[in-house]
């Protein structure tokens, strides 16, 4: 007997559905209804079909009581192929929901994405996470997808993007977005990371991730953000392969003084990077190839130094090695 | 069966930040359920502070939003609380408790507010 | 937010009476066929215990003693012949949408 496609905690917290079949039965998704977390994996379908059954054009003010009545605050949908149609008529039901998160990963979206009627409401999303979703309409997906979200948006995060740079003239400002998270698109390198950044776009930003993502110095890092008018307290530059040295012919650049936390653990360091800002209150550089202590001179001002798992911790090793860290738990680089 | 175990200091001064950690044992705090805050002062009812879900996802109680943080640990399966600039209001006993029909309680600790 | 009103705030009962405590919520707590609407029993000195989840399943571990009824906006926790040792504060709790709310309490005493 095939396992059953959905699965309700029994706390009524949980509810996934797997649909690996061809002709699956949506119909079993219904018991996801009382569910707060619902994930719903579509096994790489078409759901082209979708749009026959349905009316896109409907008026979704006839579903608000229905949709409303949902205890979902976190939906994550994957592994589909969604025309743009039936993702918007998706956004404008679940505008009437109490939905904050929503995750799209896996997802290929064809064709474009109308705009919004005026009578319309936006969803009220708090984060909004994307992963390996690529867009038919190319670099201008962020606008035509931002018009059907209300202004309140405090997460977004991009990976695996198939276009990571924006049309920044299209884009309009997020307010509220606190935290943006580019990590894992190691093509974008600082170049891309300029383009992604659009100017006076993202003026509240505290936290920004940039985790594999091909950035090559902290200087070319602090140059993006920079140009972009982007001043993060936090700014995540781990698992980088980053070079110390600057290039002399660079110019020198000035890190923003909200910038108080800076992670470049598992950067493939040999020495401390030049160019850091001058103060921070937090700064990780666990989980590199350092071979000696940092000289006083070579580091910012710091309350919080973390320098676990590089070599000259570690007697005997010439890599990054599981040994003694500063906090005195063992450390897994 | 799941067991839940508080712990961090009882006497907290004004103005400062309140942390408490919860301790899980029986159950994994990233593969299911809500793993909730919640506090009861001398003599009163209860009020619910906020979650943080097996997938990292936290929801908080708008009244204590802008003083609440809640994180995990998942490799050591703790979950923590964190309340900011503290007042004597804030005095009491504070539970973790898994699920949003709360089944599992810890046995609660005593935080009070006093300089 | 769904403020929960319990009553009476103090029940004053003797040993085998049957003690009736009531629920409202300022708005619906269901969701679909489900009310999410809970029951728990303090005492003194101790954290809550669960009693009834979704209006009317009773907890694995507690007498038969204990039920629940009702949906929407109206609950009822009714305890068929008291014990003793049901001297507690009884609170209810709704799921249904944070942020999460309890009912103020109902002091259950023995005479």
């Known amino acids: 007997t095939t396992p059953e496609p959905c699965e309700l905690d029994d706390e009524d917290f949980r509810c996934v559905c797997n649909f690996s079949e061809p002709q699956p039965d949506w119909s079993e998704a219904f018991q996801c209804v009382s569910a707060v977390e619902v994930e719903i994996h579509a096994g790489g379908l078409n759901l082209e079909p979708f749009l026959k059954r349905v009316d896109a054009d409907a008026d979704p003010r006839q579903y608000a009581d229905t949709v409303k009545a949902l205890r979902v605050r976190r939906l994550t949908v994957g592994a589909a192929q969604v025309p743009a149609q039936l993702l918007v008529g998706a956004l404008r039901v679940l505008a009437y929901s109490r939905l904050k998160e929503l995750t799209l990963e896996d997802l290929k979206i064809t064709g474009t994405m109308p705009p919004l009627p005026l009578e319309a409401t936006g969803l009220a999303l708090s984060s909004l996470r994307l992963r390996n979703v690529s867009w038919a309409t190319g670099r201008s997906w962020l606008a035509e997808l931002q018009q059907w979200l209300k202004p309140g948006l405090k997460v977004l995060s991009i990976a695996q993007a198939h276009s990571p740079a924006f049309s920044c003239e299209q884009v309009r400002a997020f307010p509220a977005l606190t935290s943006l998270d580019l990590s894992d698109n190691p093509g974008l390198g600082e170049r891309g990371l300029m383009a992604a950044l659009c100017p006076h776009k993202f003026p509240a930003i505290q936290n920004l991730a940039l985790r594999n993502t091909g950035m090559e110095t902290p200087t070319g890092v602090c140059a993006a953000l920079a140009a972009a008018g982007v001043q993060p307290h936090s700014l995540d530059l781990s698992h980088n392969s980053l070079r110390a040295t600057v290039n002399p012919s660079a110019p020198r650049c000035m890190w923003s003084s909200a910038l108080n936390s800076l992670n470049l653990s598992f950067a493939g360091l040999e020495q401390v990077p030049k160019g850091l800002p001058a103060k921070l209150r937090v700064l990780d550089l666990s989980c590199n190839r350092l071979n000696r202590a940092p000289q006083p001179d070579e580091l910012p001002e710091v309350d919080n130094l973390t320098l676990d798992g590089n070599p000259f911790l570690v007697p005997g090793t010439a890599l990054p090695h599981e040994g003694s860290m500063n906090s005195g738990v063992v450390p897994a680089c | 069966q799941v067991q839940l175990q508080e712990s961090g200091p009882g006497l907290v001064k004004p103005s400062e930040t309140l942390s408490l950690t919860c301790t899980v044992s029986?159950?994994?705090?990233?593969?299911?359920?809500?793993w909730n805050w919640i506090r009861q002062p001398p003599g009163k009812g209860l009020e619910w502070i906020g979650y943080?879900?097996?997938?990292?996802?936290?929801s908080y109680n708008p009244s204590l939003k802008s003083r609440v943080t809640i994180s995990r640990d998942t490799s050591k399966n703790q979950f923590s609380l964190k309340l900011s600039s503290v007042t004597a209001a804030d005095t009491a006993v504070y539970y973790c408790?898994?699920?949003?029909?709360?089944?599992?309680w810890g046995q609660g600790t005593l935080v009070t507010v006093s300089s | 937010e769904i403020v929960l009103t319990q009553s009476p705030a103090t029940l004053s009962l003797s040993p085998g009476e049957r003690a009736t405590l009531s629920c409202r919520a300022s708005?619906?707590?269901?969701?679909?066929?489900?009310?999410?609407l809970h029951w728990y029993q303090q005492k003194p000195g101790q954290a809550p215990r669960l009693l009834i989840y979704?209006?009317?399943n009773l907890q694995s571990g507690i007498p038969a003693r204990f039920s629940g009824s009702g949906s929407r906006t109206d609950f009822t926790l009714t305890i068929s012949s008291l014990e003793p040792e049901d001297v507690a504060v009884y609170y209810c709790?709704?799921?249904?949408?944070?942020?999460?709310?309890f009912g103020q309490g109902t002091k259950l005493e023995i005479k």
């Open positions: 709790q709704q799921s249904n949408e944070d942020p999460y709310t």
């Open positions: 029986g159950g994994s705090i990233s593969s299911d359920s809500a």
């Open positions: 408790v898994r699920g949003l029909r709360f089944a599992y």
């Open positions: 979704r209006a009317s």
């Open positions: 943080i879900s097996y997938s990292g996802s936290t």
């Open positions: 708005e619906s707590v269901d969701s679909y066929v489900n009310s999410f």
